[in-house]
């Protein structure tokens, strides 16, 4: 599931990883848009074991997954979570 995530927390990510995470381990991908308490866009992957990983938005693998998910859900936009 791709989710646009709004938070009052300042940046959640300090270090970002480019390491590939297999889709079978991914529960949800949260995107925090730039300017939402943080000057940069953040991509947070929730793994099924409840660990959270900050992913480099430029990582090829995350861009591929996000593009695929966007196409899949193009009829219904991501649900904002507050």
């Amino acid at each position: 599931v791709l989710e646009v995530y709004y938070t009052h927390l300042r940046c959640r990510c300090v270090q970002e990883s480019s390491v590939f995470i297999p889709r079978r381990f991914i529960d949800r991908i949260q995107i925090s848009p730039r300017g939402n308490g943080c000057p940069r866009k953040e991509i947070i992957v929730w793994k099924k074991n409840k660990s959270v990983v900050c992913v480099d938005p430029q990582a090829e693998w995350i861009q591929r997954i996000m593009e695929m998910l966007r196409k899949k859900s193009s009829s219904t936009p991501p649900v904002p979570v507050f």
Partner: antibody
Framework: QVQLQESGPGLVKPSETLSLTCTVS??????????VGWIRQPPGKGLEWIAH???????RYNPALKSRVTISKDTSKNQFSLKLSSVTAADTAVYYC???????????????WGQGTTVTVSS | DIQMTQSPSSLSASVGDRVTITCRAS??????????MHWYQQKPGKAPKLLIF???DLESGVPSRFSGSGSGTDFTLTISSLQPEDFATYYC?????????FGQGTKLEIK
């Protein structure tokens, strides 16, 4: 606003099972990333994490108590519960329910707390 | 388990004083460049209240006289100018590894 309220018997006999319920408002137990849990504080002592449960029913327990503890939730009632079996006087404490912040999953913190309920174990 | 050791266990101070409480973890609580160390304030008969999360982030509504610092295993909570309402017990907590663990507490008393 976020609120949590503990309820349950104030007195439990040794060897019996302690049962507590936390009723929540201002948030849903089924929202993605939501976690809630229990912490206790024996008289005059510090805080001890007991257990927490996630939106998807995944449960995490303190290994020191795991064999005696069960945490569960009823999303339709906005409640979650704690059961602690085979209690002894050492389980006498104030029991708090709390909500996890919801930002870092298994590395999160307790952002909201109930006011606590005192449980005494005595015959 | 990660052991959390606070010092001092009790402390007497006066209104206006600058106070520092330390918390040492038995192993690093850092991950992803973040220190998963949090501080709570507890007044007698009340529930703990979150003051600081991620070692140095001030919880909304908490006065700016409270600050936190540190990384790895060593952390401090500082109150820059003690107010009467600050006399309480303070706890650190780590959440980098299960089980989440708390320090034993530091009781801040009026001198």
């Amino acid at each position: 606003q976020v609120q949590l309220q503990e309820s349950g018997p104030g007195l439990v006999k040794p060897s019996e099972t302690l049962s507590l319920t936390c009723t929540v408002s201002g948030f849903s137990l089924s929202t993605f990333g939501m976690g809630v849990g229990w912490i206790r504080q024996p008289p005059g002592k510090g805080l001890e994490w007991i257990a927490h449960i996630w939106w998807d029913d995944d449960r995490r327990y303190n290994p020191a108590l795991k064999s005696r503890v069960t945490i569960s939730k009823d999303t339709s009632k906005n409640q979650f519960s704690l059961k602690l079996s085979s209690v002894t006087a050492a389980d006498t404490a104030v029991y708090y329910c709390a909500r996890i912040a919801g930002y870092y999953g298994s590395r999160d913190w307790f952002a909201y707390w109930g006011q606590g309920t005192t449980v005494t174990v005595s015959s | 388990d990660i052991q959390m050791t606070q010092s001092p266990s009790s402390l007497s101070a006066s209104v206006g004083d600058r106070v520092t409480i330390t918390c040492r973890a038995s192993e690093s609580v850092d991950n992803m460049g973040i220190s998963f160390m949090h501080w709570y304030q507890q007044k007698p008969g009340k529930a703990p209240k979150l003051l600081i999360f991620r070692a140095s982030d001030l919880e909304s509504g908490v006065p700016s006289r409270f600050s936190g610092s540190g990384s790895g295993t060593d952390f401090t909570l500082t109150i820059s100018s003690l107010q009467p309402e600050d006399f309480a017990t303070y706890y650190c907590q780590q959440s980098n590894k299960d089980p989440w663990t708390f320090g034993q507490g530091t009781k801040l008393e009026i001198k």
